[in-house]
Structures are given as structure tokens and as C-alpha cells.
């Protein structure tokens, strides 16, 4: 009658940090000899527990192995780490000099469930402009088992990644994932988000999300217009420079008269649009009595360290006009006005 070593579970899954029991029962108390637990097989197998006086941190016997009739040689491994993954064998030896291995259980594979780290989404170092294609990368690490799902979304719409890789490709204690997606920016993207969603067996149907706010990666340049308002009195003319639908807020506005700086605006009260962009209006009051010759007024807008956008507006001096008090306004570079 031969002793049988029964390991009833082919595999067990345990969350990192938790405890797991590896079951092993024998069908016989004979022959006399020790029972030992190993991880792996062959020469490289590692002794995990021996039912003797030796001390094994984190591993304890489930039942009283000193009891004569005991057939239960199950062990409990506490505070499991990803390094504990592997196949464990309960092995019966016959007492001798040396002890000889006579029977092994079928093995129990321990899968250590480790949660993926919160996904981190990174984008380009420099801001992109509408219609530009930009890449975003999502990374998560430290998960086990290897099987994982990663999805990309932009404003609720799923995006298809350029590439997703899980490393290493072979067997390992834990794994990392990296995925890249390409997004075409548009001027309405200031309020948009790109989301990387990671689903894994350890997450109980509550995927982890990494978010990239496109406001950090987009630049929408302003539309600049200069207009002249009807004179408020015979001695002054109102010029308005309007920068519309720009992002981010960083804006400098300079008024020039015939190429010379007349006023430097650092906008404080920007108007925010529903799409997340900003508008800014600058009023420039021109004293008509100081200008008898033609004057070119320039509104120069510097946005987010980009080259300046300039819009010119010419106001004709008093000497050019026979029809006193009449006013002609021309768009952008050709606006004219007669002083009285």
C-alpha cells in the first residue's frame, strides 16, 4: 500500500499582502519520514517549509503535525508578495540517511494578484495647435497576472491606440503596460480630456483611470481685430483691439502709434467662453487734437510666447479732409479717419 500525497487545488489566487493556504493531505501515516514543501522542481527547487523544528518566516502549518494521527500537512503563507508566485509541491520523504523522496503531490500553482499602479498619462512637451496630431502615452506597472485591458477615450469616445505593449513577454512576478494613442487636436479641445482606463482582475470591475486634460497640451491662437468706434466727442476717437478665442490665458497686448509703443496691456479681466477659450478687449482713446497728420495705430498681440500678431489701423489727419468731421474706417491695415 503506497502513500499518496494529495494537493486538491491545482491553483490558488491570492492578493498581494493577503494570506493563502496550500492544502496537502496524505493517505497514510507510513512510511515514517518528514514532509516538506518546495517551490519549483529539480535542482533549483526552493525549500519553503519543513514539518520539523526549523523556523520559516511567513509560513506556518495549519494543523498540529506533532499529533500521531495527523494526515494534514497544509501550510499557510502570510503577507504574500509577487515573488511568492510559482508552483508549490508537498513532498513525502522516507526516513533514512539520507531521507529519500518517495512521493510528491501534483503541485499547486500560486498566482499572486497584484494591482496595477494608477495609470499615468503623459503628452507632448510642447503645446500643439488645432489640426495637429499629438501622441499621448499611458503607463501602469506592478500588476499580476499578466492579463490586462487598456482602453483610451476622448470625451467619451473610444480611441484606438497606435501601440500597446505588456512587458516582460515571458513569465515574471509582475508586469508593466505602456500604450500610445494619437489625437488630432481641434480648437474646441480646451475642455476635453483624454482618459486611459486600465481593467484588471484585482480591480473588482472598477477600472483605474489616468487623465490628461487637453488644456495642458493645446494652444489656440487668438483672432485679432481692430475697430474704430464713433467718436465720443469731436476731440477723441475710440479704437478697440479684440483678441478672441485664445488659450492659454498668457497674453500681452501693446498699442503702437506709428511704430512707437504707446501703451502696454497686461490683461487681467479676461472673458471666458463656454468652450474654455478666452476673449480680451482693449480700448484705446486717441486725442484728436494731438494728431493733425495721418497716424498708423498698431495693436500687437503676443500669445503664449508665440510670434506677435499685429493689426494696423490708419487714422487720416485733419489736413487730408475737405469734408470735415467725416470718417472712413477700413479693415485692419487700411482703416482711415479724418480729424477735425
Amino acid at each position: 500500500t503506497e502513500v499518496k500525497v494529495i494537493q486538491p487545488e491545482k491553483s490558488v489566487s491570492v492578493a498581494a499582502g493577503d494570506s493563502t493556504v496550500l492544502n496537502c493531505t496524505l493517505t497514510s501515516l507510513l512510511p515514517v519520514g518528514p514532509i516538506r514543501w518546495y517551490r519549483g522542481v529539480g535542482q533549483s527547487r526552493q525549500l519553503i517549509y519543513s514539518f520539523t523544528t526549523e523556523h520559516f518566516p511567513r509560513v506556518t502549518n495549519v494543523s498540529d503535525a506533532t499529533k500521531r494521527s495527523n494526515l494534514d500537512f497544509s501550510i499557510r503563507i502570510s503577507n504574500v508578495t509577487p515573488e511568492d508566485a510559482g508552483t508549490y509541491y508537498c513532498v513525502k520523504f522516507q526516513r533514512g540517511s539520507p531521507d529519500t523522496e518517495i512521493q510528491s503531490g501534483g503541485g499547486t500553482e500560486v498566482y499572486v494578484l497584484a494591482k496595477p499602479s494608477p495609470p499615468e498619462v503623459s503628452g507632448p512637451a510642447d503645446r500643439g495647435i488645432p489640426d495637429q496630431k499629438v501622441n499621448f502615452t499611458c503607463k501602469s506597472h506592478g500588476f499580476s497576472p499578466r492579463n490586462i485591458t487598456l482602453k483610451w477615450f476622448k470625451d467619451g469616445q473610444e480611441l484606438h491606440p497606435l501601440e500597446t505593449t505588456v512587458n516582460p513577454s515571458g513569465k515574471n512576478v509582475s508586469y508593466n503596460i505602456s500604450s500610445t494613442v494619437r489625437v488630432v487636436l481641434n480648437s474646441m479641445d480646451v475642455n476635453s480630456k483624454v482618459i486611459c482606463e486600465v481593467a484588471h482582475i484585482t480591480l473588482d470591475r472598477s477600472p483605474l483611470r489616468g487623465i490628461a486634460n487637453l488644456s495642458n497640451f493645446i494652444r489656440v491662437s487668438p483672432t485679432v481685430k481692430v475697430t474704430q468706434q464713433s467718436p465720443t466727442s469731436m476731440n477723441q476717437v475710440n479704437l478697440t483691439c479684440r483678441a478672441e478665442r485664445f488659450y492659454p490665458e498668457d497674453l500681452q497686448l501693446i498699442w503702437l502709434e506709428n511704430g512707437n509703443v504707446s501703451r502696454n496691456d497686461t490683461p487681467k479681466n479676461l472673458t471666458k467662453n463656454t468652450d474654455g477659450t478666452y476673449n480680451y478687449t482693449s480700448l484705446f482713446l486717441v486725442n484728436s487734437s494731438a494728431h493733425r497728420e495721418d497716424v498708423v495705430f498698431t495693436c500687437q498681440v503676443k500669445h503664449d510666447q508665440q510670434p506677435a500678431i499685429t493689426r494696423n489701423h490708419t487714422v487720416l489727419g485733419f489736413a487730408h479732409s475737405s469734408d470735415q468731421g467725416s470718417m472712413q474706417t477700413f479693415p485692419d491695415n487700411n482703416a482711415t479717419h479724418n480729424w477735425n
Epitope: 493517505t27 497514510s28 507510513l30 494543523s63 494521527s69 494526515l71
Partner: antibody, heavy 119, light 107 residues
């Protein structure tokens, strides 16, 4: 002093499932070190070990009955039970529950309950 | 399964006689053997555990010996209250098995 008491129907119809419960008093079923067994004795015959549940969890069955037998424990009620399916007249017997002692022998037994399989 | 063969299947002896029952295992079971007494209509009672150890409260006229495959149970001086059937049981191998029993009667 631990005492055991079997309970269950005395008459079971062929092909049905025989269900017996052993109630433990004077001690806890989950206290360490013991096997809790079911044994039966056919009329005028010897003793046959059906199976046992060990305090640490494993359940052992006699291979001759394994396909039909289930032993379970309810620690909250301090009971363990036996279910034997698809019974025939050959399962007519006195059924005992027992507890293994500090040493290896079965030192506490219930008084036994007679189960007859008949239509 | 380990077969446990008990002999004789029955015996008749006088009060005060020495009674010997043997139990043979089909394979080496070391000393993993118990002896029980069962009186008519009652549950078995443990007398000897681990082949030779007397259970607490059991009279010293009962004894056991043996190891490996051959075991002996002895009543040194038969008493009227010893009328019963005696069983050996091995627990070295699953399933645990009992001998067929020896019925002891008074002449």
C-alpha cells in the same frame, strides 16, 4: 465531557438521500486536533468507516462510498453531518458518529441511530 | 485498502481465564492500531490505542501488543462484564478499516 448525539429519519426510501446530523455538546467541534467520523454497522455485522472531517478542514472518505457520500460541518451549530445519496437496502445499518481523542483512538461515540432503507 | 483479519471470530472461555485475540494487517501498519469493545445494542468503546496504550479508565486486565502486521489483544482474567465483541482498527492508511470482530462469551 464531550457527548455526541445522532439525529435523522429512521426510514428512507430507496434512491433517496439519507441525511444524518451529529450534535456535539460539552465541547467545541472546532477545537484543535480531532477527527470527527461517521461509522456504520450493518445488522449483525462488523464496523465500516464511512469518512471523517478533520478539525483543520480536510475531509476523508471511504473510497467504497465516496461517490455517494458528503460530510460537512457547521461550527456555528456545533454539528457535523452525513449525506448518503441513492440509497439501497444495502445501506440499512446503525449509523454512529464519533470523535477521535487526544490520542488516536475514537474515544467518544454517539449511541447510534438505526436507518432502514425501504419503500 | 488494508485488510484486518481477526481471529478467532468467536470464543468461549470461563471467568478468570486468560483470553487472547489476534489481528493481522495485510501490510505493515507500524503501531497505528486501536482495540474496541462493543456490547450488544451499544456503541463501541475504546480500550487500547496505539497498539499497546490503555485508555484512561479502562481496567488493567486489558492489554495490547504488537507492531508491523501482527497484533495481540489480551484479557488477563475474563470477567462476566467482558462479554462483548472486540474489534481492532488500523489508522495507518486511509480508509481506516476494522477487523471482522471477535465475539467473546462465557462458558
Amino acid at each position: 465531557q464531550v457527548q455526541l448525539q445522532e439525529s435523522g429519519p429512521g426510514l428512507v426510501k430507496p434512491s433517496q438521500t439519507l441525511s444524518l446530523t451529529c450534535t456535539v455538546s460539552g465541547g467545541s467541534i472546532s477545537s484543535g486536533g480531532y477527527y470527527w467520523s461517521w461509522i456504520r454497522q450493518h445488522p449483525g455485522k462488523g464496523l465500516e468507516w464511512i469518512g471523517a472531517i478533520y478539525y483543520s478542514g480536510p475531509i476523508y472518505y471511504n473510497p467504497s462510498l465516496k461517490s455517494r457520500v458528503t460530510i460537512s460541518v457547521d461550527t456555528s451549530k456545533n454539528q457535523f453531518s452525513l449525506k448518503l445519496s441513492s440509497v439501497t437496502a444495502a445501506d440499512t445499518a446503525v449509523y454512529y458518529c464519533s470523535k477521535e481523542g487526544y490520542h488516536s483512538g475514537m474515544d467518544v461515540w454517539g449511541q447510534g441511530t438505526t436507518v432502514t432503507v425501504s419503500s | 485498502d488494508i485488510q484486518m483479519t481477526q481471529s478467532p471470530s468467536s470464543l468461549s472461555a470461563s471467568v478468570g481465564d486468560r483470553v487472547t485475540i489476534t489481528c493481522q494487517a495485510s501490510d505493515d501498519i507500524s503501531d497505528y492500531l486501536n482495540w474496541y469493545q462493543q456490547k450488544p445494542g451499544k456503541a463501541p468503546k475504546l480500550l487500547i490505542y496505539d497498539a499497546s496504550n490503555l485508555e484512561t479508565g479502562v481496567p488493567s486486565r486489558f492489554s495490547g501488543s504488537g507492531s508491523g502486521t501482527d497484533f495481540t489483544f489480551t484479557i488477563s482474567s475474563l470477567q462476566p462484564e467482558d462479554i462483548a465483541t472486540y474489534y481492532c482498527q488500523q489508522f495507518a492508511y486511509l480508509p481506516w478499516t476494522f477487523g471482522g470482530g471477535t465475539k467473546v462469551e462465557i462458558k
